[in-house]
């Protein structure tokens, strides 16, 4: 992990950086939790999907994500973050067609249907924290990262490097 | 920048198992974001997919092979193992491990793989 | 599984001339996920193109994929000394992945 003003650096490029090639290096099927190891949940509620931070029950089976990883012009200046020196993008996909976009205006994370091409909402810069965590940071606005708030999922804008480790913006992926 | 090198006996006996080991280097096979895979290439023929794993150690094998074929993975060595059993000597090759790709198919629910790094190939012969 | 076939076999041009090989698929496939590979003799193949289109890393932009649904495409715009190989397709959008048999690209 790095301080804010390496992130700001980082980041700056990300209005202009392009994914290289349209199709995705590899992909990922993996459930996402919390770094206090809650789940995140999606159901199907009146034709549209919800997204939902609870703890499972002990044998409930948890929800399974599609992360697509996508390299970006843009350099890595982060080791591990990167593929060939490339910072890589993700997107993530809960189920067929519908993926995790950045709502700037509402501050929200919401379910779209689309088709590819993406929008850019749909793309996330993807941060190797520490205790094997990962971080989201949105393509369309540097500094925004995926968190919890409030048992859903929101945008937070990082401001200071305390915030940039700080727990609500730090997830786990694993296969179980 | 990842490197791959295969390892094993060059002569496998007909009915016994062929081990080959594949030594990961320039990155590591727990930190990466990519999948794992051995491939083979009988002489002067075209190429066929043995099978995949995840460092995670789960596994996507080539349903033709399935029953003969075992990959796994060593993290702590950087290493992943292919295992084929009952060999004839249809299963001489060139033998290559490589990283892979992995990308799911929602209608499926299976993954398939390409291959962007390549080791330099080892080559089995099966004979008496 | 999905058979690809490839065409032709065998492409006899010079150094400086177009290259144009063909894949074509059994049966569509939506994704794309079709990968182009380049060997030379007693070499590993190498990956030239991955997503139908995308150049791997260190490719050099003469090499050009192109095509969807069951017919792919390489260009190799201007053929160098160094491009003389043997040229496979790979679907990746269906288990198995399969290869195509192969197009030799050979000096004229």
């Known amino acids: 992990a790095f301080g804010i003003s390496g992130v700001q650096k980082y980041t700056r490029a990300l209005h202009d950086s392009s994914i290289t090639g349209i199709s995705p290096i590899t992909e990922y099927l993996a459930s996402l939790s919390t770094y206090n190891d809650q789940s995140i949940t999606f159901a199907l509620e009146d034709e549209s999907y919800e997204i939902y931070v609870e703890d499972l029950k002990k044998d409930e089976k948890k929800d399974k994500v599609l992360l697509s990883y996508y390299e970006s012009q843009h350099p890595s200046n982060e080791s591990g973050d990167g593929v060939d020196g490339k910072m890589l993008m993700v997107t993530l996909s809960p189920t067929k067609d519908f993926w995790l976009h950045a709502n700037n205006k509402e501050h929200s994370v919401e379910l779209h249907k689309c088709e590819k091409p993406l929008p850019d909402q749909a793309f996330f810069v993807l941060h190797n924290m520490h205790s094997n965590c990962v971080s989201f940071e949105c393509k369309t606005d540097p500094g925004v990262f995926i968190g919890v708030k409030d048992n859903h999922l929101a945008l937070i804008k990082v401001d200071s490097s305390e915030n940039l480790c700080t727990e609500n913006i730090l997830f786990k992926l694993s296969e179980t | 920048q990842v490197q791959l090198q295969e390892s094993g006996p060059g002569l496998v006996k007909p009915s016994e198992t062929l081990s080959l080991t594949c030594t990961v280097s320039g990155g590591s096979i727990r930190s990466s974001i990519f999948y794992w895979g051995w491939i083979r290439q009988p002489p002067g023929k075209g190429l066929e997919w043995i099978g995949s794993?995840?460092?995670?150690?789960?596994?996507y094998y080539n349903p033709s092979l399935k029953s003969r074929v075992t990959i796994s993975v060593d993290t702590s060595k950087n290493q992943f193992s292919l295992m084929l059993t009952s060999v004839t000597a249809a299963d001489t090759a060139v033998y290559y491990c490589?990283?892979?790709?992995?990308?799911?198919?929602?209608?499926?629910?299976?993954?398939?793989?390409?291959?962007?790094?390549w080791g330099n190939g080892t080559t089995v012969t099966v004979s008496s | 599984e999905i058979v690809l076939t490839q065409s032709p076999g065998t492409l006899s041009l010079s150094p400086g001339e177009r290259a144009t090989l063909s894949c074509r698929a059994s049966q569509s496939f939506s994704s794309s996920y079709l990968a182009w590979y380049q060997q030379k003799p007693g070499q590993a193949p190498r990956l030239l193109i991955y997503?139908?289109?995308s150049r791997a890393t260190g490719i050099p932009d003469r090499f050009s994929g192109s095509g969807s649904g069951t017919d792919f495409t390489l260009t190799i715009s201007r053929l160098e000394p160094e491009d003389f190989a043997v040229y496979y397709c790979?679907?990746?959008?269906?288990?198995?992945?399969?290869f195509g048999g192969g197009t030799k690209v050979e000096i004229k």
């Open positions: 790979q679907q990746y959008d269906r288990s198995p992945l399969t």
């Open positions: 490589a990283r892979a790709g992995g990308l799911y198919n929602w209608n499926d629910e299976s993954f398939s793989f390409y291959m962007d790094v």
């Open positions: 794993i995840y460092y995670s150690g789960r596994t």
């Open positions: 997503g139908a289109s």
